[in-house]
Each structure stands twice: as structure tokens, then as C-alpha cells.
């Protein structure tokens, strides 16, 4: 918990303007929730709901708040110490090497496969060949049998900073 | 339950220095900010300073940061805070509060240490 | 430093009034301001944080508003146990700073 994050670890986009760049304060560092003043003298508080810090810092700005995208619902709202958790809609899902979007879920498996796992909001409907049971990727064949998946699951903290 | 235990009321002539301890209990000592805050006789509060044992990190208010210094002894969960210099106005209550890492908003509160300054 | 100006300083109230005492911060605070009651004699306690959210088991009757520089807690049906000095406190900047009181008591 007392990690701490600084301007060299950030995003370039995240990280303050050079000329408002500045060596680490004699004073130390600000606590999660808070960002350090200009002069290096005072923390102050990221504002609730726009923008937070998860780590003492000597960040000059705390970072911007995530908003849900359409798509997606708010599992639990941005406070000055933690970003927003955003997860896929019911029957939608989020691909690893595709994070920026959620995609729908298939709805039913191929034939000669059976589905072995559910519809998430961090993963598509599992299919596993009948005999081999070797898993199928790839993407949706044209034609699909009518085995149809339950896209009800629990909850995941899939947060994105965005 | 979380309590906040300070030490005895002192008695100090004007130019001595006085130590005033806090011992936590009834939660992770090192996951909360803890504070110093006085209180001069029928006055208001007054926010000196702070000590995270996650990290060592003390802040001072500038007002004190001349004449305060605030320690702990993670073994015992206790924070110290030594005010040096003593003058009359010195003269209150000193509590020491904690917050949680996030907003600094005092959750809960030692009992308070009096301090006299007095020739 | 921010300086918070409590008003009134002193505040005579009836069980069952409805009170309202006010908090202006010397600059913007955002929402940063927080609600202490003190007893004599006694520690403050929590009852207001994020000039709204109400403390855990501070009762209903509490209630905190404001934004930027002013702020108000009321207290909807004073008990005689609400009797104490109420702090308005900023935790936007350090040093963080406290208005000077106001004193409630029973008419």
C-alpha cells in the first residue's frame, strides 16, 4: 500500500507540462486521493467524481476519471483514490487484445461443438469439439446450432483507465 | 474496536520542550494517516502535521514545522509528537486523530493530552 | 492558508427547531469540507465528509450541503443531545484548517 507513483512513471499524455515539472519536494510526497502543489509545499485533494490518485505521488494533477462507455455499466464510481469500474453490458464481452471495446457474444456454438462455458463480460461463450474437445477460436461460423448461452454472470472489477 | 490512547496531562516551563504520545490499536497501524491537532483553551482546532507509518512520510503544517517533530515506534503502533520552544500560547489540548489514505477528514480521535505552559 | 468562517459563532435553539449553521471558505474547496461535533471535555467526532456524505451512525437528522465556498449543516429536529460545538472543517489543501465554532445550545 505505500507505493508511490511519480511524473517518470506516468503516460506521456498524463504527465505535467515540462515547464511545470519538478524535482521530488523536500517534503515528501501526498497521499492517495491527493496530488502536490506547484511549489511543492501543499497536497491537494483530486476532486470526487473528476479525477483521483491511487498512490502517494508528487503528481502535479491527479488523472482524469473514466467515463463508461455506451456499452458498458458502472459496476462502482470514480472516488478521489480509485478510478471507475467499468464492465460489459449483460451478453457482451471484452477481449484482452481488443480492451477499448465490448463485442457481443455469440450466441450458440458450431456444429459438432458443445459450449462449455458461459458469456461473460470478460470473455465469449466457450466451445469445445464434441469428440477432440480441443476449443474452438476463431471467429463466428455462418451456421450455428441453437445452443444458446446464458449471459448472466457475477461481477468482475475489469477497470480500464482511460 | 479502534482506539487512539494518548499519555498524561504535562506541566512545562515556557522555553522546554514536551513529547506527547499516541498509542493506536484495533486496526492495521500502517494502513492509516496519523494526525496532531491542538486545541488552545476555549479556541478552535488546529491541524499540525502528520505521520504515514506505511511509508515514514510527515508533513507539517509551516506554522509548527520549526518547532514540531512527529515519530513513531512501529513495534509499539505509538506516534510521538514533540513540540519544542514552549510559550504560553502553546498552552491546549493535543489530540491525535487518524485518516484512511484518501481525504483528510479525521475519523477517529485520541483523547486528548492537556499541556500547560506555565512560569 | 484557507480560512473558514463559521456563522453564527453562538446558536440558541428549541427541541424539535430546525438548525442551520454555515461554513464560507476564503477560496474554492470543491466539495472538500467535513462536519465535527464536540462535547466538553470531550474529542471531536466525524459527522459530515465530502460537505454531504454522513458518517457511519451519525443519525439521519444531520445533514451537510454546499460546494465551493459555502456550506451549511443542519440538523432537521434538535435533540437535547445535540447540544456541543460544531467545526466546519476544509480538507481540500494542507494545511487543512477548521472554522471556529458554533456553539449550540438549548433554549
Known amino acids: 500500500e505505500s507505493a508511490l507513483i511519480t511524473q517518470q512513471d506516468l503516460a506521456p499524455q498524463q504527465r505535467a507540462a515540462p515547464q511545470q515539472k519538478r524535482s521530488s519536494p523536500s517534503e515528501g510526497l501526498c497521499p492517495p486521493g491527493h496530488h502536490i502543489s506547484e511549489d511543492g509545499r501543499d497536497c491537494i485533494s483530486c476532486k470526487y467524481g473528476q479525477d483521483y490518485s491511487t498512490h502517494w505521488n508528487d503528481l502535479l494533477f491527479c488523472l482524469r476519471c473514466t467515463r463508461c462507455d455506451s456499452g458498458e455499466v458502472e459496476l462502482s464510481p470514480c472516488t478521489t483514490t480509485r478510478n471507475t469500474v467499468c464492465q460489459c453490458e449483460e451478453g457482451t464481452f471484452r477481449e484482452e487484445d481488443s480492451p477499448e471495446m465490448c463485442r457481443k457474444c455469440r450466441t450458440g456454438c458450431p456444429r459438432g461443438m458443445v459450449k462449455v462455458g458461459d458469456c461473460t463480460p470478460w470473455s465469449d461463450i466457450e466451445c469445445v469439439h464434441k469428440e477432440s474437445g480441443t476449443k474452438h477460436s476463431g471467429e463466428v461460423p455462418a451456421v450455428e446450432e441453437t445452443v444458446t448461452s446464458s449471459p448472466g454472470t457475477p461481477a468482475s472489477p475489469c477497470s480500464l483507465s482511460g | 474496536q479502534v482506539q487512539l490512547v494518548q499519555s498524561g496531562a504535562e506541566v512545562k516551563k515556557p522555553g522546554a520542550s514536551v513529547k506527547v504520545s499516541c498509542k493506536a490499536s484495533?486496526?492495521?497501524?500502517?494502513?492509516?494517516?496519523l494526525h496532531w491537532v491542538r486545541q488552545a483553551p476555549g479556541q478552535g482546532l488546529e491541524w499540525m502535521g502528520w505521520?504515514?507509518?506505511?511509508?515514514?512520510?510527515?508533513k507539517y503544517n509551516e506554522k509548527f514545522k520549526d518547532r514540531v517533530t512527529i515519530t513513531a515506534d512501529k513495534s509499539t503502533s505509538t506516534v510521538y509528537m514533540e513540540l519544542s520552544s514552549l510559550r504560553s500560547e502553546d498552552t491546549a489540548v493535543y489530540y491525535c486523530a487518524r485518516h484512511e489514505q484518501g481525504p483528510g477528514y479525521f475519523d477517529y480521535w485520541g483523547q486528548g493530552t492537556l499541556v500547560t505552559v506555565s512560569s | 492558508d484557507i480560512q473558514m468562517t463559521q456563522s453564527p459563532s453562538f446558536l440558541s435553539a428549541s427541541v424539535g427547531d430546525r438548525v442551520t449553521i454555515t461554513c464560507r471558505a476564503s477560496q474554492d474547496v470543491n466539495t472538500a469540507v467535513a462536519w465535527y461535533q464536540q462535547k466538553p471535555g470531550k474529542a471531536p467526532k466525524l459527522l459530515i465528509y465530502w460537505a454531504s456524505t454522513r458518517h457511519t451512525g451519525v443519525p439521519s437528522r444531520f445533514s451537510g450541503s454546499g460546494s465551493g465556498t459555502d456550506f451549511t449543516l443542519t440538523i432537521s429536529s434538535l435533540q437535547p443531545e445535540d447540544i456541543a460545538t460544531y467545526y466546519c472543517?476544509?480538507?481540500?489543501?494542507?494545511?487543512?484548517?477548521f472554522g471556529g465554532g458554533t456553539k449550540l445550545e438549548i433554549k
Open positions: 505521520f504515514y507509518p506505511g511509508n515514514n512520510n510527515i
Open positions: 484495533g486496526y492495521t497501524f500502517t494502513e492509516y494517516i
Open positions: 472543517q476544509q480538507h481540500y489543501i494542507t494545511p487543512w484548517t
